[in-house]
C-alpha cells in the first residue's frame, strides 16, 4: 500500500465566518520539513505555499483576499515531505457573511428567564431565504439550523445557567452564504440552585479551535525530536 504522512490540521484564523470583501486566513498545520502545502477548494487545487526554510516551521497560512460567495465552501489541505504526500485534512467550511440583509432576533418569553423555563428564539428576515442559523458567542461551531419562509424558530428545552450568553442569528442563502448577523440577544438565566457552582460560563475569548498554532522549531525542539526518534528506534 502507498505510504502517506499523517493528515494535517486545517483551521480558520480568528473565524470561519468571513464578511464579504474581507480577507480570510486559513492555516494548514502539517509537519516540520514539509516542503509544500496545497490548499484545495471543493476538491480542486486552489493555492500552493512553500515554507522557507521548510525544516523550521510546521505549517503555513493561506490568505484569501476579497471574500465572496464564489470563495465560500469546503476547503482542505495536504502537505509533502520529499516525495511523500500526506493524507487530506478534514474539511473546513468557510462561510461568507454580510450578504444582503440583517435579520432580527427575538427570544420568548424574554431575555431574562429562570432555570427550568422553556425558551424559543425567533429569527426573522424579510428577504427570500429558507434557512436560518442560530449561534451562541464563544460556541460558533455549534450552529443550530431551522427553516421557514420569513422567520424560523429555535426551541430550547428547559434552560439552565449553561444556556446563558449572547446569541445571534443569520439568514442563509445557501450553506456558505449568510446574511449580516442580527443584533445579539443576551440570555440571562437565574435561579439554577442545584448546579449554579458547576455551571459553565461562556468564554469571552474566541473559539479555541479558531486559532492558528504554527510554531517555528527551536534547537530544543530539534533535540527533543532527535531524542524521540532514538527512543522509538530503541523500543523497536
Amino acid at each position: 500500500p502507498k505510504q502517506t504522512l499523517p493528515k494535517p490540521i486545517i483551521r480558520a484564523e480568528s473565524t470561519y465566518m468571513v464578511p464579504k470583501e474581507k480577507q480570510a486566513t486559513l492555516c494548514c498545520q502539517g509537519s516540520y520539513g514539509a516542503v509544500e502545502y496545497q490548499l484545495h477548494f471543493e476538491g480542486s487545487l486552489f493555492a500552493v505555499e512553500r515554507p522557507k526554510p521548510p525544516e523550521r516551521i510546521n505549517g503555513v497560512k493561506f490568505h484569501i483576499p476579497d471574500m465572496n460567495s464564489r470563495k465560500a465552501g469546503r476547503y482542505s489541505c495536504i502537505y509533502r515531505v520529499g516525495e511523500l504526500w500526506s493524507e487530506r485534512s478534514d474539511l473546513l467550511d468557510l462561510v461568507v457573511t454580510e450578504m444582503y440583509d440583517t435579520p432580527t432576533l427575538s427570544v420568548h418569553p424574554g431575555p431574562e428567564v429562570t432555570s427550568g423555563e422553556k425558551v424559543t428564539f425567533y429569527c426573522r428576515l424579510d428577504t427570500a431565504t429558507s434557512m436560518f442559523l442560530l449561534l451562541k458567542e464563544g460556541r460558533s461551531r455549534d450552529v443550530q439550523r431551522s427553516y421557514g419562509k420569513v422567520q424560523a424558530e429555535f426551541p430550547m428545552g428547559p434552560v439552565t445557567t449553561a444556556h446563558r450568553g449572547s446569541y445571534r442569528c443569520f439568514g442563509s442563502y445557501n450553506n456558505y452564504a449568510w446574511s449580516f448577523p442580527s443584533e445579539p440577544v443576551k440570555l440571562l438565566v437565574t435561579g439554577d440552585i442545584e448546579n449554579t457552582s458547576l455551571a459553565p460560563t461562556d468564554p469571552t475569548f474566541p473559539d479555541s479551535w479558531d486559532t492558528c498554532l504554527l510554531t517555528r522549531e527551536t534547537g530544543l525542539q530539534k533535540d527533543l525530536a532527535l531524542w524521540d526518534h532514538t527512543a522509538q528506534n530503541l523500543l523497536r
Partner: antibody, heavy 115, light 107 residues
Framework: QVQLQQPGAELVKPGASVRLSCKAF????????MHWVKQRPGQGLEWIGM????????KYNEKFKSKATLTVDKSSSTAYMQLSSLTSEDSAVYFC????????WGQGTLVTVSA | DIQMTQSPSSLSASLGERVSLTCRAS??????LNWLQQEPDGTIKRLIY???SLDSGVPKRFSGSRSGSDYSLTISSLESEDFVDYYC?????????FGGGTKLEIK
C-alpha cells in the same frame, strides 16, 4: 405604572372586519411581546397569537391564522389585531397582554357581531 | 397542542381556609407556567409566573409549586377578595394554552 388601554366595546356586522387596538403606557413597548387572548361569554381563555414589536416576529395559534392579523405601530406604542369575516362565533372579549409571560393585561374589548 | 387539565372546576371554601388548585400538563412544560386571577368584571391579573415566582404586589398567601407534571396554586388563608376565577397558563410550547379555570366560591 404599566397600563394597556383597550376600547370597551365594538359592534360589527357579520362578514365585516374590525381592528382592535391596545395602547401601551409605562414600559418600553418595543422590548416585550404582545399577546392577544379571546374569551367567549362564560367561557375560558384562548390564545390567538403574539407579536414582537421590535422584530416584527409574529406567531399565531393555527386556529386563528386565517381570522386574525397582528400588527404594531411603534411610534404610538400601539398593538393592533384585525379580525376578518366576522361571525357570531367571534363575539367575545379580546384581551391584549404585554410581556412574554403575560405580565400585564388590558381590560379587554367586547366585540359583538350582530346584524 | 399541550392540554392543561385544571381541577377542580369549582370549589367552595370558607374564609381562612387553605386551598390548592391543580393543573396537569399533557406534555413536559418545564417551569413555564403562570397562574392568573380573573375578577367578576373581567380584569385579569397574573399572580405567579415560572411555576413558583410571586408577582410583585401579590399577597404572600399565594404560592406556586410543581410535582412532575402537576402544578399547584395554594392560597394559605382565604380572604374575601380571593373568591374569583383562577386559570393556569403554559407558555412552554406554542400554542400557549390555558387550563379550563377554577371558580372559587364562598361557603
Amino acid at each position: 405604572q404599566v397600563q394597556l388601554q383597550q376600547p370597551g366595546a365594538e359592534l360589527v356586522k357579520p362578514g365585516a372586519s374590525v381592528r382592535l387596538s391596545c395602547k401601551a403606557f409605562g414600559y418600553t413597548f418595543t422590548s416585550y411581546w404582545m399577546h392577544w387572548v379571546k374569551q367567549r361569554p362564560g367561557q375560558g381563555l384562548e390564545w390567538i397569537g403574539m407579536i414582537h414589536p421590535n422584530s416584527g416576529v409574529t406567531k399565531y395559534n393555527e386556529k386563528f391564522k386565517s381570522k386574525a392579523t397582528l400588527t404594531v405601530d411603534k411610534s404610538s406604542s400601539t398593538a393592533y389585531m384585525q379580525l376578518s369575516s366576522l361571525t357570531s362565533e367571534d363575539s367575545a372579549v379580546y384581551f391584549c397582554a404585554g410581556d412574554g409571560r403575560f405580565a400585564y393585561w388590558g381590560q379587554g374589548t367586547l366585540v359583538t357581531v350582530s346584524a | 397542542d399541550i392540554q392543561m387539565t385544571q381541577s377542580p372546576s369549582s370549589l367552595s371554601a370558607s374564609l381562612g381556609e387553605r386551598v390548592s388548585l391543580t393543573c396537569r400538563a399533557s406534555q413536559d412544560i418545564g417551569n413555564s407556567l403562570n397562574w392568573l386571577q380573573q375578577e367578576p368584571d373581567g380584569t385579569i391579573k397574573r399572580l405567579i409566573y415560572a411555576t413558583s415566582s410571586l408577582d410583585s404586589g401579590v399577597p404572600k398567601r399565594f404560592s406556586g409549586s410543581r410535582s412532575g407534571s402537576d402544578y399547584s396554586l395554594t392560597i394559605s388563608s382565604l380572604e374575601s377578595e380571593d373568591f374569583v376565577d383562577y386559570y393556569c397558563l403554559q407558555y412552554a410550547s406554542s400554542p400557549w394554552t390555558f387550563g379550563g379555570g377554577t371558580k372559587l366560591e364562598i361557603k
